[in-house]
Amino acid sequence: LIIGFGISGRHSITVTTVASAGNIGEDGILSCTFEPDIKLSDIVIQWLKEGVLGLVHEFKEGKDELSEQDEMFRGRTAVFADQVIVGNASLRLKNVQLTDAGTYKCYIITSKGKGNANLEYKTGAFSMPEVNVDYNASSETLRCEAPRWFPQPTVVWASQVDQGANFSEVSNTSFELNSENVTMKVVSVLYNVTINNTYSCMIENDIAKATGDIKVTESEIKRRSHLQLLNSKAS
């Protein structure tokens, strides 16, 4: 969480951002809130990115002002116009690119004063894993598959029964480049699987951590997956 304060002239206002991560090819949100104003026409929102000459986005007098918007963000940005009046300056970024990563500044002007806060935005790819039972040549294995990851993650297996066991010797992980030549499909196979046990496949890079759990019994197989973004720090 980054909380910024305005400096000069008029009173300063509090602006708060949250470091976040974008999933490439999907839409992302750059979060920013501020002390609201009673008149929409008095609010100016500017989003800037370190190292980029033009603006990322500008909203003033109740509407978008994109004449100074940088080419790399053309047609890809929007604020939540109906929420600006309540202090939401968050930016929606369409079709997140790897190159969108960096330091952004959310700069606010209202009748009460000015303020800004920086935001670290990471980009990559992350997806939920699915764990299934595979059966080949009379032996049961578990196959953990996740369609899109970048940068290349680590994959670790764990088991409820054999807590603390190292499964690296009895598992095999492969990374297959997807058609867009950036993200990769993750496939990890665990051998020597026993029934009446819960196994977890944990996939992690510096952006996200995902877990696929599978509980295997004779009568049923229970599966669940979780995805957690890392380093979501507020400023």
Partner: antibody
Framework: EVQLVQSGAEVKKPGSSVKVSCKAS????????MHWVRQAPGQGLEWMGE????????NYNQKFKGRVTLTVDKSTSTAYMELSSLRSEDTAVYYC???????WGQGTTVTVSS | DIQMTQSPSSLSASVGDRVTITCSAS??????LNWYQQKPGKAVKLLIY???RLHSGVPSRFSGSGSGTDFTLTISSLQPEDFATYYC?????????FGGGTKVEIK
């Protein structure tokens, strides 16, 4: 005795939604997942999804994802299946089944017709 | 999705006959296979789970066998109450899929 009692038959217009209930008794509701399966007239059985009543974690059949919503009310030990944007092909008998699909409800007939 | 193919789709048999229904999976599912019985207007009943384990209360004339991709449900001596439709179902991989069903009719 394990029992799953489902709500009565429904007739719906195309484009509308239907919500089917399944009241469980005779066992600890939160200890078993609940599955939903449908059967179109003269057809076989088709699995739609499953929900863990303890925390409402859901696995959907991708075929229905976006159209089906599974929920539970722990206070009444009732599971619900809501299907939206109904079309004529959704005319079927809808069943709830306790995981591991060992006990089934009696079925709810949903007819989609203009 | 895993395809489950049941055969025959229907059969005629007499009381006392030995009846065999087969189910084939499009890929290996180990032993994660259930067999169900369905009668018109009645709740579906689980007969066998994990290929060969008899569900509680199911008569011993029902048995299951197989592994991998090929499975069999056998009724050793058909009784009047056994005339119904039988389904296999795999639960190895999501989405769970059923066979097309086998209707057992009176000859």
């Amino acid at each position: 005795e394990v029992q799953l009692v489902q709500s009565g038959a429904e007739v719906k217009k195309p484009g509308s939604s239907v919500k089917v209930s399944c009241k469980a008794s005779g066992y600890t509701f939160t200890s078993y997942w609940m599955h939903w399966v449908r059967q179109a007239p003269g057809q076989g059985l088709e699995w739609m999804g499953e929900i863990d009543p303890s925390d409402s974690y859901i696995n959907y059949n991708q075929k229905f994802k976006g159209r089906v919503t599974l929920t539970v009310d722990k206070s009444t030990s009732t599971a619900y299946m809501e299907l939206s944007s109904l079309r004529s092909e959704d005319t079927a008998v809808y069943y709830c089944a306790r995981g591991p699909r060992d006990y089934w409800g009696q079925g709810t007939t949903v007819t989609v017709s203009s | 999705d895993i395809q489950m193919t049941q055969s025959p789709s229907s059969l005629s048999a007499s009381v006392g006959d030995r009846v065999t229904i087969t189910c084939s999976a499009s890929q290996g599912i180990s032993n994660y296979l259930n067999w169900y019985q369905q009668k018109p207007g009645k709740a579906v009943k689980l007969l066998i789970y994990y290929t060969s384990r008899l569900h509680s209360g199911v008569p011993s004339r029902f048995s299951g066998s197989g592994s991998g991709t090929d499975f069999t449900l056998t009724i050793s001596s058909l009784q009047p109450e056994d005339f119904a439709t039988y389904y296999c179902q795999q639960y190895s991989k999501l989405p769970y899929t059923f066979g097309g069903g086998t209707k057992v009719e009176i000859k």
